[in-house]
């Protein structure tokens, strides 16, 4: 229904707290360099204006679109050109081009320092002094570093943060209460960020149809008892919600997501038997819970998929009649039978089925042609199954850090032109798949591994797009989203690469490394490992292991030495010489 004032409508629907949080997220995601105070001032102005529109929807400017209102606010910021360069040119455009321009200038890798968590005492003091400002800072800092973070979900994480601080700041040992809990939230939020970025990439590069196919597969796996019409309705609504969030329409997105959660809870009987626990929770927790609810029990009497999609005489007629509906039905039926497959795999199978029908239905004897299609799925299914087995075996043998190193070597060989920080970040993230997925029951491993890897590789592609350096990466990133992971997996050593010359300073370390947190130490060592591979792309695993063991021993010895500086300056050059010899 049309509202006289869009801003008043959203303020009324969302309530002041969520309204302000979402506006803050929106501004922080668009203008990533502005300080919290600058954004907080704008948010207050927008909120005050919204309240005047609630009081009188006919008041001046209350009928303007949200993009117009928000865009005008952003364009009124002083020193916009000095701070943001060509982003300021967006302000010369009219809506909707102006918003599109803002979206194009979102930076997936802003040059901001890592978000450092203050020590427990300081955190609790500022939280107690002003919880609202404290949480505002959290929203601002996360949103500007993750410009596509799913806004209503970020409100959920802020709420989690709030609850943890409320609980732990009352404890005697605040630090040991806060650290594991906040680490847990951070880990989940980071995964949520890359997953959502993947959804926005799907929407931006391949349109709503591609995202809707993803949603149909995912929802069919989770709700195998819902009929196709129900799944289609949920997928359509979910597509709208995600389109809005990816497009910067955060108020509409959060509002529609709340509506979708409400619909699901009111229609549990036709969707799933597993929703009640989620539906008993308050809004943010409810929507989050529904987004990761466990799969419903599969119906016991599902007929074989071949009946309708291979053996039926009407296959080509049904396909001709309504291609998208027929393929959608295939994806629904296949996905509800396979909660043990990744969504990426299910979409590859649907694509293979579509290609088979395109080819076969044009032949004189289609049934003879498409009759073997299900058998042709086998290699497509085996490939990711083997990937999971191989990688989980390796993870179990090496542990997370060793597994990350193995991936780092592999990916540096595949794309040695990519910057070392990007390779290290990617390998660390890809390596976490072991901890995240390899400990799960067998039937949950494949979906966990492949869909997580796809999201991480999407980030690799986004970073590479900014400064393309590797033909290998460009090739894999320019294909369809669901083919990316198999493409990266199939890459081998880049034979075109001219090895980097050996620079001693790259492998020269100082005593300051000894006081670094374990994570930072690992990153330093992994940086050195990537550089070694760039110097010797064809070094054997054995050679690299020898060098890295020597390196670890050197660090251990010098960090335990009475005179660390002297140890580093005398033993360091010896290490470099040994490394060169080992790799010769």
């Amino acid at each position: 229904e049309a509202h006289k004032s869009e801003i008043a409508h959203r303020y009324n629907d969302l309530g002041e707290q969520h309204f302000k949080g979402l506006v803050l997220i929106a501004f922080s995601q668009y203008l990533q360099k502005c300080s919290y105070d600058e954004h907080a001032k704008l948010v207050q102005e927008v909120t005050d204006f919204a309240k005047t529109c609630v009081a009188d929807e006919s008041a001046a400017n209350c009928d303007k679109s949200l993009h117009t209102l928000f865009g005008d606010k952003l364009c009124a910021i002083p020193n916009l050109r000095e701070n943001y360069g060509e982003l300021a040119d967006c302000c010369t455009k009219q809506e909707p081009e102006r918003n599109e321009c803002f979206l194009q200038h979102k930076d997936d890798n802003p040059s901001l320092p890592p978000f450092e968590r203050p020590e427990a005492e300081a955190m609790c003091t500022s939280f107690k002094e002003n919880p609202t400002t404290f949480m505002g800072h959290y929203l601002h800092e996360v949103a500007r570093r993750h410009p596509y973070f799913y806004a209503p979900e970020l409100l959920y994480y802020a709420e989690q943060y709030n609850e943890i601080l409320t609980q732990c700041c009352a404890e005697a040992d605040k630090e040991s209460c806060l650290t594991p809990k906040l680490d847990g939230v951070k880990e989940k939020a980071l995964v949520s960020s890359v997953r959502q970025r993947m959804k926005c990439s799907s929407m931006q590069k391949f349109g709503e149809r591609a995202f809707k196919a993803w949603a149909v597969a995912r929802l069919s796996q989770t709700f195998p008892n819902a009929d196709f019409a129900e799944i289609t309705k949920l997928a359509t609504d979910l597509t709208k919600v995600n389109k809005e969030c990816c497009h910067g329409d955060l108020l509409e997105c959060a509002d529609d997501r709340a509506e979708l959660a409400k619909y699901m809870c009111e229609n549990q009987a036709t969707i799933s038997s597993k929703l009640q626990t989620c539906c008993d929770k308050p809004l943010l927790k409810k929507a989050h819970c529904l987004s990761e609810v466990e799969h419903d029990t599969m119906p016991a009497d599902l007929p074989a998929i071949a009946a309708d999609f291979v053996e039926d005489q009407e296959v080509c007629k049904n396909y001709a009649e309504a291609k998208d509906v027929f393929l959608g039905t295939f994806l629904y039926e296949y996905s509800r039978r396979h909660p043990d497959y990744s969504v990426s795999l299910l979409l590859r199978l649907a694509k293979k089925y579509e290609a088979t029908l395109e080819k076969c239905c044009a032949e004189a004897n289609p049934p003879a042609c498409y009759g073997t299609v299900l058998a042709e799925f086998q290699p497509l299914v085996e490939e990711p199954k083997n990937l999971v087995k191989t990688n989980c075996d390796l993870y179990e043998k090496l542990g997370e850090y060793g597994f990350q190193n193995a991936i780092l070597v592999r990916y540096t060989q595949k794309a040695p032109q990519v910057s070392t920080p990007t390779l290290v970040e990617a390998a660390r993230n890809l390596g976490r798949v072991g901890t995240k997925c390899c400990t799960l029951p067998e039937d949950q491993r494949l979906p966990c591994v492949e869909d997580y890897l796809s999201a991480i590789l999407n980030r690799v592609c986004l970073l590479h797009e900014k400064t393309p350096v590797s033909e290998h990466v460009t090739k894999c990133c320019s294909g369809s989203l669901v083919e990316r992971r198999p493409c990266f997996s199939a890459l081998t050593v880049d034979e075109t690469y001219v090895p980097k010359e050996f620079k001693a300073e790259t492998f020269t370390f100082h005593s300051d490394i000894c006081t670094l947190p374990e994570k930072e130490k690992q990153i330093k060592k992994q940086t050195a490992l990537a550089e070694l591979v760039k110097h010797k792309p064809k070094a054997t695993a054995e050679q690299l292991k020898t060098v890295m063991d020597d390196f670890a021993q050197f660090l251990d010895t010098c960090c335990k030495a009475a005179d660390k500086d002297t140890c580093f300056s005398t033993e360091g050059p010896n290490l470099v010489t040994r490394c060169k010899d080992a790799l010769a």
Partner: nanobody, 115 residues
Framework: EVQLLESGGGLVQPGGSLRLSCAAS????????MSWVRQAPGKGLEWVSS????????LYADSVKGRFTISRDNSKNTLYLQMNSLRPEDTAVYYC????????SSQGTLVTVSS
């Protein structure tokens, strides 16, 4: 919506000829193989002939081979069946179908071969 409309049937003497047409709409005609099937009075459906989307590949039932010719005009979205040397056992309702479907989703056209 897919629509198939057959025409050209009628009464013909043994040894005579007929040309059946099938006008198609509601789908990309050239992307689909098409078939003719028939149903004689009191019998089940029988496949007669098929043609690929491009028209380059054709198949015939043994009972009509050498007598019937299937063809198509993709610019007119039309399928044809040229029937020569007709026999009494060719009497049936003829249907055009998409792909290899052995089913009736249209009205069909009646061919009667009788002296």
């Amino acid at each position: 919506e897919v629509q198939l409309l057959e025409s050209g049937g009628g009464l013909v003497q043994p040894g005579g000829s007929l040309r059946l047409s099938c006008a198609a709409s509601g789908f990309v005609f050239s992307s689909f193989g098409m078939s003719w099937v028939r149903q004689a009075p009191g019998k089940g459906l029988e496949w007669v002939s098929s043609i690929s989307g491009s028209g380059s590949d054709t198949l015939y039932a043994d009972s009509v081979k050498g007598r019937f010719t299937i063809s198509r005009d993709n610019s007119k979205n039309t399928l044809y069946l040229q029937m020569n040397s007709l026999r009494p056992e060719d009497t049936a309702v003829y249907y055009c179908t998409i792909g290899g479907s052995l089913s009736r989703s249209s009205q069909g056209t009646l061919v009667t071969v009788s002296s």
